[in-house]
């Protein structure tokens, strides 16, 4: 019998993973090196996989190799002396210099450079810089960028304000519809802010004398309802009113007079008014009882080649004649004149020039007030310093308001480098069909009123004071302000301003930035301003958009019901 | 006027150790919001991003070749450097330096690389 | 890392022509830039910071967009514009570029 040989040589099993072999009978045992298996050790055993030992144990990541494994980590984490765990590296701590100007965040197996709201980081520079959201396109109409941040802006002049989401423009509505019938019968006064409304020149028979008969209203106290001419010059007649009374004056070779009668007719009814030269007098009736005579030596206009030449100005005169007056007066006069009678010629013509022209036509209803219709403003020269006053400057504000719309600038200070640094507001409120009050100083806005009912038949009354150091407001209100600290800031920007020059509007803003306040829109309402004790009178502006009305005010359009005509009781004038 | 040129061995063996410098004039690498910037281009083929230094020498790598890759500077001679270990036959491509600065970004003409056995 | 993919890959165009190429990236990147590759020379800056015309580029190129989506524009085309442009983003490392845009004259 032959001797088995040694099963172990040559050696089966394999050389990387055995550890011993054992020969038997005819056959042989290999014994296997951690991490191998198989008759003869020839597979590896992949620990990572092995379902005892989840990932080898490996926090992260398990690499299997070839009789054992071993553990490593994701970037950004160091293994730990385990040689199975991984922990984070802070790369904030480790290099403090990797952001740059910005803030270092460590995040798991990174690090983020983090900027502030409106910022964002330059990776090449290594530093915040504003996001310029303009160039993203994120208004709908003007968009300012600055530092961190941008704002939106509409154009208020085109009748657009800011929708509530702060980028979009939506048109300013009307929450309270006035009566804005006209007729071409009445013939308003006051279509220019400086100029005649109307002129016309008559040639009569030398016989005739100057007669002129019209129906009259008006809420204005003064101004010039016609005014006659020689064709030369040499001899007129003015009649106006003042104080609301009709007032006369004349001027020929004989004769110079002034004369003023009657009662008071500025009370918004159709007064029958006629002015009749007779032979040796001038005779003015109201309803057509006499109230003034006026005794003259000759005819008024001196006939010339057998005609009487006249020159007829309704609602003013020639700018020369203004030194010529006996008595200096504004000829600015809001009023209307219908069924008028010249020189006893009926309405002559008349009625045909006018019915061409809407703006010379008169509002069939008015009330006492002025109306700003939306599309202008009226500008005023006030000095607010008050020598005796310790505190120096100050502003003490009165308004009665019936807005037609909810957003626009009722009063605002421009000074002379374009700036806004006060300004009162009226704004849309979030809560629907009620109206903010707001306050600004430049575009900061200092106060908000919020949540008033004010697009109401009655009107609104709001009356506050400032000076340099504080800002009161005497309607009993509830208010949303800025802090003291931030208020006293923006009060020094008013105080600087208001040790320069500033010109006073109602009613909107003049050409200002669209940045320049939170509000830019026109104010569209009734409006009747006092300030520093005296009542704004829109005849005695510098300068006035035609479109206001300074002594008329439309009557609200009436509907069924009046539902919807309460306003917050603390704001109705007790006056 | 910024100029910069590269220049380097030419051409290598395999698992050699790649050396580049990039000298610079007309500005300064110590100046804050400066910095340098590694950049291949193998013949025919698109750019790749290599390595970036800043002015305050902070570095920063392709994490595909951070192993590789060793990013330095020589202010005092106005120089860049770059290392790549251990290089194949995939490391053949032009190589070019730029700036990326606050008064614009320049290239250099770039050195080109052959890996070869 | 970010993935720039540009587009179209090759296309020509006539003199005079008005030319767009787009570079679209995987993730938001605030900051986009292009470069100019003629055959032989290096990479020429044309448009940094995604809008900004580089010093002595002609104004006809111009470069817009944002987040996602960015695409550099020549008003007219001239002959000397016939060359390769890539975009590259400057706003995370890895900075990654475009495959590039071929531009050749028709």
């Known amino acids: 019998v032959n001797a088995i040989p040694d099963q172990c040589s040559p050696l089966p099993c394999n050389e990387d993973g055995y550890m011993s072999c054992k020969d038997g009978k005819a056959s042989f045992t290999c014994t296997c090196k951690p991490g191998w298996q198989g008759e003869k050790c020839e597979f590896d055993i992949n620990e990572c996989k092995d379902p005892s030992n989840i990932n080898g144990g490996c926090s992260q990541i398990c690499d299997n190799t070839p009789g054992s494994y071993h553990c490593s980590c994701k970037s950004g984490f160091v293994m730990l002396s385990n040689k199975k765990d991984c922990k984070d590296v802070d790369e904030c701590s480790l290099k403090p210099n990797m952001c740059g100007t910005a803030v270092c965040k460590n995040i798991p197996g990174d690090f983020e450079c983090e900027c502030p709201e409106g910022y964002r980081y330059n990776l090449k520079s290594k530093s915040c810089e504003d996001v310029d959201e303009c160039s993203e396109n994120m208004c709908a109409q003007l968009c300012v960028n600055y530092p961190g941040g941008y704002t939106c802006y509409c154009d208020g002049k085109k009748g657009f304000k800011l929708a509530q989401d702060q980028k979009s423009c939506e048109a300013v509505s009307v929450c309270l519809p006035l009566n804005l019938d006209t007729k071409y019968e009445l013939l308003y006064l006051a279509e220019q802010f400086a100029g005649v409304v109307l002129y016309l020149k008559f040639r009569l028979p030398e016989i005739s004398r100057f007669s002129a008969e019209f129906d009259f209203r008006t809420y204005d106290s003064q101004g010039v309802i016609l005014y006659a001419e020689s064709i030369d010059h040499s001899a007129w007649l003015l009649i106006a009113l003042r104080g609301g009374k009709i007032e006369v004056q004349l001027k020929n070779e004989h004769t110079s007079k002034i004369t003023t009668g009657g009662d008071i007719i500025n009370n918004g009814l159709w007064n029958m008014v006629s002015v009749e030269e007779l032979e040796h007098s001038i005779s003015i009736k109201i309803a057509k009882e006499a109230v003034m005579d006026i005794n003259k030596p000759g005819p008024l206009f001196k006939p010339e080649n057998g005609l009487l030449e006249t020159k007829v100005y309704f609602a003013g005169f020639p700018r020369k004649v203004e030194s010529e007056l006996i008595k200096p007066i504004n000829p600015r006069l809001d009023g209307c004149i219908r069924s008028w009678n010249l020189m006893k010629q009926g309405a002559s013509g008349i009625k045909e020039i006018i019915q061409e022209k809407q703006n010379k036509h008169c509002l069939v209803t008015v009330e006492k007030g002025s109306y700003y219709p939306g599309s202008g403003i009226a500008e005023f020269h006030i000095d607010y310093n008050n020598g005796s006053n310790a505190e120096g400057w100050h502003i003490n504000v009165t308004l009665n308001i019936r807005p037609s719309m909810g957003t626009g600038v009722m009063l605002a200070l421009v000074s002379s480098n374009n700036t806004v640094p006060f300004a009162v507001s009226l704004v849309d409120s979030t809560s629907e069909k009620s109206q903010d009050i707001v306050i600004s100083v430049e575009n900061t806005v200092i106060y908000r009123i919020q949540a008033l009912s004010l697009c109401s038949n009655q009107r609104s009354h709001l009356e506050f004071r400032v000076n340099r150091n504080n800002l009161e407001l005497l309607t009993p209100l509830k208010i949303e302000t800025i802090s003291q600290e931030e208020l006293q800031t923006q009060l020094a920007i008013l105080d600087k301003a208001m040790k320069g020059k500033v010109a006073t509007y109602l009613g909107g803003l003049p050409d200002v930035p669209f940045s320049a306040t939170p509000v830019n829109a026109f104010y569209n309402g009734c409006m009747e301003v006092n300030i520093n004790g005296v009542e704004l009178d829109l005849d005695e502006a510098i300068s006035k958009h035609n479109d206001i009305r300074a002594h008329s005010c439309p009557s609200v359009w009436k509907k069924t019901k009046n539902s919807e005509d309460q306003v917050d009781p603390r704001l109705i004038d007790g006056k | 006027q910024v100029t910069l040129k590269e220049s380097g061995p030419g051409i290598l063996q395999p698992s050699q150790t790649l050396s580049l410098t990039c000298s610079f004039s007309?500005?300064?690498?110590?100046?804050?919001?400066?910095?340098v910037s590694w950049i291949r281009q193998p013949s025919g083929k698109g750019l790749e991003w290599l390595a970036h230094?800043?002015?305050?020498?902070?570095?920063r790598y392709n994490p595909s070749l951070k192993s590789r890759l060793t990013i330095s500077r020589d202010t005092s001679s106005n120089q860049v450097f770059l290392k790549i270990t251990s290089v194949d036959t995939a490391d053949t491509a032009t190589y070019y330096c730029?700036?990326?600065?606050?008064?614009?970004?320049?290239w250099g003409q770039g050195t080109t690389l052959t890996v070869s056995s | 890392q970010i993935v720039l993919t540009q587009s179209p890959a090759i296309m020509s165009a006539s003199p005079g022509e008005k030319v767009t190429m787009t570079c679209s990236a995987s993730?938001?990147?605030?900051?986009m830039y292009w470069y100019q590759q003629k055959p032989g020379s290096s990479p020429r800056i044309l448009i940094y910071?995604?809008?900004n015309l580089a010093s002595g580029v002609p104004v006809r190129f111009s470069g817009s967009g944002s987040g996602t989506s960015y695409s550099l524009t020549i008003s007219r085309m001239e002959a000397e514009d016939a060359a390769t442009y890539y975009c590259?983003?400057?706003?995370?490392?890895?900075?990654?570029f475009g495959a590039g845009t071929k531009l050749e004259l028709k």
């Open positions: 730029a700036l990326y600065g606050n008064y614009g970004d320049y």
């Open positions: 007309g500005f300064s690498l110590s100046t804050s919001g400066m910095g």
């Open positions: 230094i800043y002015w305050d020498d902070d570095k």
């Open positions: 993730s938001s990147v605030s900051y």
């Open positions: 910071d995604t809008s």
């Open positions: 590259q983003q400057w706003s995370s490392y890895p900075l990654t």
